[in-house]
Amino acid sequence: MEPRAVADALETGEEDAVTEALRSFNREHSQSFTFDDAQQEDRKRLAKLLVSVLEQGLSPKHRVTWLQTIRILSRDRSCLDSFASRQSLHALACYADIAISEEPIPQPPDMDVLLESLKCLCNLVLSSPTAQMLAAEARLVVRLAERVGLYRKRSYPHEVQFFDLRLLFLLTALRTDVRQQLFQELHGVRLLTDALELTLGVAPKENPLVILPAQETERAMEILKVLFNITYDSVKREVDEEDAALYRYLGTLLRHCVMADAAGDRTEEFHGHTVNLLGNLPLKCLDVLLALELHEGSLEFMGVNMDVINALLAFLEKRLHQTHRLKECVAPVLSVLTECARMHRPARKFLKAQVLPPLRDVRTRPEVGDLLRNKLVRLMTHLDTDVKRVAAEFLFVLCSESVPRFIKYTGYGNAAGLLAARGLMAGGRPEGQYSEDEDTDTEEYREAKASINPVTGRVEEKPPNPMEGMTEEQKEHEAMKLVNMFDKLSR
Amino acid sequence: MGCTLSAEDKAAVERSKMIDRNLREDGEKAAREVKLLLLGAGESGKSTIVKQMKIIHEAGYSEEECKQYKAVVYSNTIQSIIAIIRAMGRLKIDFGDAARADDARQLFVLAGAAEEGFMTAELAGVIKRLWKDSGVQACFNRSREYQLNDSAAYYLNDLDRIAQPNYIPTQQDVLRTRVKTTGIVETHFTFKDLHFKMFDVGGQRSERKKWIHCFEGVTAIIFCVALSDYDLVLAEDEEMNRMHESMKLFDSICNNKWFTDTSIILFLNKKDLFEEKIKKSPLTICYPEYAGSNTYEEAAAYIQCQFEDLNKRKDTKEIYTHFTCATDTKNVQFVFDAVTDVIIKNNLKDCGLF
């Protein structure tokens, strides 16, 4: 049914006819996400009519139908202005049972109505800056947080929980004030850590061989995204004893996530959100990644369970295959691994053994090949300085921040970017001294060492002198040509 | 007869091994000597690399050394404001407040009379008033059309601190100073068993013998280019834009017979300034044929290709390109702050409508 016909039916006001028109429109457009320009004015007119009814109150019998039409039209950018008003947003928030209002909502709310309103709010907040501002002013986050806290006590359908969390994600992603509010006033980290534990269903028997069901995966990912939003600009501060315990507990849940698989091909995505959040944990709380108890079949190195570090390394390997969105794909996992290696000698030694094993192949340049080392060295000259820096920093830390060792494994040419950024082009040793980690040379490396060009990091025969056979005068003449060039350059 | 060796044979084998080892060690000593040539145009960020080495490698500049840079900081600051005022005349830009014309006249008088290493309160006041003027700011925003030191805004925005009578330049202030380099500055440093000699080459024709010893057996050339130079308009005495000048030189050096097997480390510096500029000044100013978008990624990649494509020996000669921001010496606790915004944006992008 055309929007004009629906609008006409609305204006005539006959209830059954209106409901039928709306139902027909909804059926036809349930999967419409782009709209025909020709009917734009008709849709805007329909949106205005819907809003006027919405603001006065929808009749209980047909609420879901009306809200479905609003949801469909809220996908259309040209209709956003109509819906993004204080009254409309308040009405939708009331139906979603998240309005801060004086009058108590009749219990229990109709879950279908609640769900449709939440979907409308998600669409509006995602697409309309005005709606974002109004939602922040209306403090929708307060009631949303309250409801998330009730999941343990009352059973809400998966879809309601998911859209609660999605709306929380949108509000915290788009509004710094909401982020702060959830983090501080509403104790968001504690609240969402609790929700994550409930969703993972882990307490308290840790079993890494779990496959998280589809619905739980969806909810867990929303929680991880909200936690990311509210922690990324907050946890770099020093944390007190109590907060450290909370973040370490969150860390143990994230450790569990790293070791778990998600149903329906969503494992990498799930792990991606987990790793992003790990990167926001206070650095001193990353020790939880190495605190997994040793058990039958766990990967032990220097008396420490390396299952989690190994899983993160496997995740990095997978991510390095991608060319798309490289920065956000590899920077978080590299940062987490770098910090683990920086602070924990067993992790550093384990990672060095995996990523920078003793050099054997000294005939190939470090950036050539398919080993993890080669891929990471290639990133060291990447156009994106953030990507370049995380890759270089990771390898540098695995070399215990020893410049000679770093040059040995990557070549001075590749290393120059990090060394320049750190002011280490001429060596020097950083403040953070490492307990001296020894570096083993293979027989192959020792044999070839004299022929290795430190700049390229591979064996090269001594090139013939291009000036062979020239007289001193000729050499001087050639040199002066260069000097004139440099003179031009330095003016 | 078995495979046993007599005592004499054993001794001979040992001697032979020893000789081999000594030969190898001599070879290693020579091979482990790395000769670097540091090249780059006037404001390419080349000297910053050397200063940075000093700051971190030698525990920084001492307070005494920093004090010696005070005069350079003042000179850089005064020269910057003078360059902007002069350009206002050329670009026909008026002062926002007519009273500033008197300050401008006063500036030239006071600057001429200023004692090296001192800045009077009067001179500081004049500079401050001028720098705040809307006309001066408008002219500063067009600095690509004339020659202006990159650190102009850094010093001028910090005038209150710099003009204090007890001012001592910070490490960062020293990094920002600009002094014309002449001749050759040789730096030696050692990484374990690697002995590096770096020659920072200025343009002065000093005695010829010295040059030859500089160019023979170079392991790598560090070539610095300021990315942000791409949109600078030619000064009257120049034949080509600075970026093209750098490319022309890079071509000559990269393919020079003296450096047939010499790797090149190409530092494309000042990426922070470039990132800001590219939003306002299109890359076509420098490369009219450029058809990409004016985003940092695409534009920077294009410049990288322009330089790397000049290498005529791609199979045997390595070019290591690094995009850098030469004044960033902060040895930060490494976290991925730079990535967080991107993560949130992408998480949003992945959110569909319902």
């Epitope: 307490a203 315990a245 370490r248 143990t252 939880v288 | -």
Partner: nanobody
């Protein structure tokens, strides 16, 4: 304030069993690693067992295979099930918390008053 209260211990025959519990209050129990440690007459403190926030466990060599540590986060309670007891297990048993949610074996920040377990015929 943080409180850890162990249940009554007792006298047990060699080969017998005993279950200790520890009621925690004054902090968010589930955020912390918890331990059982013991002190035999005239000896120093000996670490017995540890449990992490999600139930992962580890044990001292002398009790491995005989003792089982567990926790109920909903009830804020830590347990130690002791089987096949031997006279060498005679000691005062303490329930102890690791600081700031970190893993630890010796540097506890709080421990209970202790409860006496005696294994004797």
């Amino acid at each position: 304030q943080v409180q850890l209260v162990e249940s009554e211990g007792g006298l047990v025959q060699p080969g017998g069993s005993l279950r200790l519990s520890c009621a925690a209050s004054g902090f968010t129990f589930k955020y912390y690693y918890m331990n059982w440690v013991r002190q035999a007459p005239g000896k120093g403190l000996e670490w017995v067992s540890r449990i992490n926030q999600l139930g992962g466990t580890s044990y001292g060599d002398s009790v491995k295979g005989r003792f089982t540590i567990s926790r109920d986060n909903a009830k804020n309670t830590l347990y130690l099930q002791m089987n096949s007891l031997v006279p060498e297990d005679t000691a005062v048993y303490y329930c102890a918390r690791c600081p700031a949610g970190a893993a630890c074996k010796v540097e506890y920040d709080y421990r209970g008053q202790g409860t006496q377990v005696t294994v004797s015929s």
